[in-house]
Amino acid sequence: LPAQVAFTPYAPEPGSTCRLREYYDQTAQMCCSKCSPGQHAKVFCTKTSDTVCDSCEDSTYTQLWNWVPECLSCGSRCSSDQVETQACTREQNRICTCRPGWYCALSKQEGSCRQCMRLSKCGPGFGVARPGTETSDVVCKPCAPGTFSNTTSSTDICRPHQICNVVAIPGNASMDAVCTSTSPTRSMAPGAVHLPQPVSTRSQHTQPTPEPSTAPSTSFLLPMGPSPPAEGSTGD
């Protein structure tokens, strides 16, 4: 004979367990139905009647199949340094994550953050060695010879000094090199400033002293946008 399908509640065979989405009620000594996510057990089962489930009230939830007598309370509202990335519903808790520019210094369960901290900024002469993540702060490092950073930022890395035909002012850790130049190195470099005398700006690598130049030069180009390459530095 085919095995009969047992309807809850039912007494399990000795040594066997209840099926999926059922639980064993110690009092009734029966396998009974669990409540679905978003519900809780309003009345527990007996030998003759199954579990009675009810929906979670506002601001409470259950995420799993369960037989809890009360739904769990959703976490408190997200703080000002957080963003609600998952709303509180009957089936899931609210999740608060740190807003951009912040990272989670102390996390709770379920992906929420207990304490957010502002990402550190690397000052001039320092660049980002390791970017900040959702759970870790920025790590800064001094700009190596031939590179620079002239910003205070949690994202900017040290950039190479620009290459110059003739170096007017050598670059250093916090400043790009300034080139003696007859024309800008960038098509309409944003924010480029032309001075009456020669120079261009982006950076280099070597040590500091301007280069002697035999080339005519007519304008100074001071950089205020992206800056590139170099490796040793002094001035030509």
Partner: antibody
Framework: EVQLLESGGGLVQPGGSLRLSCAAS????????MHWVRQAPGKGLEWVSA????????YYADSVKGRFTISRDNSKNTLYLQMNSLRAEDTAVYYC?????????????WGQGTLVTVSS | QSVLTQPPSASGTPGQRVTISCTGS?????????VHWYQQLPGTAPKLLIY???QRPSGVPDRFSGSKSGTSASLAISGLRSEDEADYYC???????????FGGGTKLTVLG
């Protein structure tokens, strides 16, 4: 007429050294950055190193930093590339090139190239 | 892998117009840096073809033209000739690197 003439290439064993030279004429040598650019057999162009006109500032690709040294003698209108700790992947034709007027990031004149082969 | 991206090959028949693209990013072409183009005929050294996006050195025919927009640039060759068969490379400065960066090169074949 601008002319750039490289020399010094050849066959060298891995770990060995070689010094390339580039004789320049036809322009005011000390007023321009000079570059070395290489091209592995059947491959594309790769910038290697540069030096400012007054020889005070040098620039290197990460792939050669610490192994190659660029220099120039403005009195002789000559550019050099000292290559140490050579590797098989350094095998290429090495070109010397002149930085452009007002913008050293382009090369308005190139030499004919010299072949460097690193092999045991 | 090259910092600037070019199609590996392109082709056209004599008299046709062919365009070669060069795609970069916000740290090179998109940062406002000029794009330069080089032509390398078989067995010879590269030669400057276009500088500062659209400028032609003296001696380069006006059949060659360059343009730039956003994070990409293109080289156009009109009235294609058999002697245009060569490798073409784009190049630009990049904020994060010490020297100019090149595209991987495009081999142009003139058919027929």
């Amino acid at each position: 007429e601008v002319q750039l003439l490289e020399s010094g290439g050849g066959l060298v064993q891995p770990g060995g050294s070689l010094r390339l030279s580039c004789a320049a004429s036809g322009f005011t040598f000390s007023s321009y950055a000079m570059h070395w650019v290489r091209q592995a057999p059947g491959k594309g162009l790769e910038w290697v190193s540069a030096i400012s006109g007054g020889a005070t500032t040098t620039y290197y690709a990460d792939s050669v930093k610490g192994r190659f040294t660029i220099s120039r003698d403005n009195s002789k209108n000559t550019l050099y590339l000292q290559m140490n700790s050579l590797r098989a992947e350094d095998t290429a034709v090495y070109y010397c090139a002149k930085g452009g007027t007002g913008d050293p990031y382009y090369f308005d004149y190139w030499g004919q190239g010299t072949l460097v082969t690193v092999s045991s | 892998q090259s910092v600037l991206t070019q199609p590996p090959s392109a082709s056209g028949t004599p008299g046709q117009r062919v365009t070669i693209s060069c795609t970069g990013s916000s740290s090179n072409i998109g940062a406002g840096y000029d794009v330069h183009w080089y032509q390398q005929l078989p067995g010879t050294a590269p030669k400057l073809l276009i500088y500062r996006n659209n400028q032609r050195p003296s001696g380069v025919p006006d059949r060659f033209s360059g343009s730039k927009s956003g994070t990409s640039a293109s080289l156009a060759i009109s009235g294609l000739r058999s002697e245009d068969e060569a490798d073409y490379y784009c190049a630009a400065r990049d904020d994060g690197l010490s020297g100019p960066v090149f595209g991987g090169g495009t081999k142009l074949t003139v058919l027929g």
